[in-house]
Amino acid sequence: ILGGREAEAHARPYMASVQLNGAHLCGGVLVAEQWVLSAAHCLEDAADGKVQVLLGAHSLSQPEPSKRLYDVLRAVPHPDSQPDTIDHDLLLLQLSEKATLGPAVRPLPWQRVDRDVAPGTLCDVAGWGIVNHAGRRPDSLQHVLLPVLDRATCNRRTHHDGAITERLMCAESNRRDSCKGDSGGPLVCGGVLEGVVTSGSRVCGNRKKPGIYTRVASYAAWIDSVLA
């Protein structure tokens, strides 16, 4: 997270760290007792590694009573996700067992009504991604509030030049932005999950290259079918 600040510890009990061989790889969001939603591209290079999900964490390194690392029983990328596009960049991870819920571990309601979030709406994005352009990784969860950007502006040639489909949304990126390592994390508007940070190699913090988020409402049928 660029231009953000340390989150209040455990105030986002839905927040997950998707880990590869014991190290933070991507963000994720607990959407059901046994399911974490993240980004499909996160697992592209994870073929031989051990993927796990950390829940109940604020610090990645320090012991915390609520922290628990779960093995992954099943990883379900969206069937239409492809390495070279930002489209359909969703991944559902089934935990080896139901998460132990409590004040620091709780699923987040996700948006089912397929309607665009109004431009200018302030949404919260959180993650353990890099916090500066030098690539410094934080130990504790960071967050930032970002205004939603209308899709037409996001599709301008000087922004994302037509790449933003109706299944994607954008948020402003003027110094405050999601960045590398935040992919798969939640964009939360009014207490509801609206978007998932896409995992392209986008430049961060440049206002002309807004953050791109997969709209979960557009994938409600797929999410329901996997969770069923």
């Epitope: 899709r151 037409a152 301008r156 000087t158 037509g162 790449a163």
Partner: antibody
Framework: EVQLVESGGGLVQPGGSLRLSCAAS????????MNWVRQAPGKGLEWIGD????????DYNADFKRRFTFSLDTSKSTAYLQMNSLRAEDTAVYYC?????????WGQGTLVTVSS | DIQLTQSPSSLSASVGDRVTITCRSS???????????LEWYQQKPGKAPNLLIY???NRFSGVPSRFSGSGSGTDFTLTISSLQPEDFATYYC?????????FGQGTKVEIK
């Protein structure tokens, strides 16, 4: 399939007004800026300006700002170009073109002739 | 406003010829985001323009590989490696980096 269809062109007297329409189909109208470009007979392309279909924000080439106005009817997925105080030198084919990717999608153009 | 000057204004060539059109801008067209929004369009009589090249050197989908773009700063080039009968048209460069966006005056490619 993305389609842009202009209409409303024709013969108009100097000092008169005309409203051109650009009806869009095959995509979500509010997802892309609409631009207007004109081309005088035998001449090059000239950018008139653009409009954001979500916010209604506009940007005009300074040469057209006083006399030309953009508007929208999002329920009809249509953009409009209102032209006032027309002059002979406004005689041209007028195009609408969607921005994103680049100007990949254009209407067929509508001819406006300003003559007495 | 940024002016784009194309040269030549017109040229005569034969099928199979290599054709080069240049476009010079009155100032740099590198955008504040670091990208250069220099595009090339092809237009045939009575038709709307067609996008060929975007961001200096990227071919738009469906554009034949004989079309290529290059350049940087203020000097840009469109090259047609082997002219085909359907390539006889007028070509325009365009800059989208700075408002007002502007077109070059055009280069008409005619049959020799």
């Amino acid at each position: 399939e993305v389609q842009l269809v202009e209409s409303g062109g024709g013969l108009v007297q100097p000092g008169g007004s005309l409203r051109l329409s650009c009806a869009a189909s095959g995509y979500q109208f509010t997802s892309y800026y609409m631009n207007w470009v004109r081309q005088a007979p035998g001449k090059g392309l000239e950018w008139i300006g653009d409009i954001n279909p979500v916010t209604g924000d506009t940007d005009y080439n300074a040469d057209f700002k006083r006399r030309f106005t953009f508007s929208l009817d999002t329920s009809k997925s249509t953009a409009y170009l209102q032209m006032n105080s027309l002059r002979a030198e406004d005689t041209a084919v007028y195009y609408c073109t969607r921005e994103g990717p680049s100007f990949a999608y254009w209407g067929q153009g509508t001819l406006v002739t300003v003559s007495s | 406003d940024i002016q784009l000057t194309q040269s030549p204004s017109s040229l005569s060539a034969s099928v199979g010829d290599r054709v080069t059109i240049t476009c010079r801008s009155s100032q740099t067209i590198v955008h504040s985001n670091g990208d250069t929004y220099l595009e090339w369009y092809q237009q045939k009589p009575g038709k709307a323009p067609n996008l060929l090249i975007y961001k200096v050197s990227n071919r738009f989908s469906g554009v034949p590989s004989r079309f290529s773009g290059s350049g940087s700063g203020t000097d840009f080039t469109l090259t047609i490696s082997s002219l085909q009968p359907e390539d006889f048209a007028t070509y325009y460069c365009f800059q989208g980096s700075h408002v007002p966006v502007t077109f070059g005056q055009g280069t008409k490619v005619e049959i020799k």
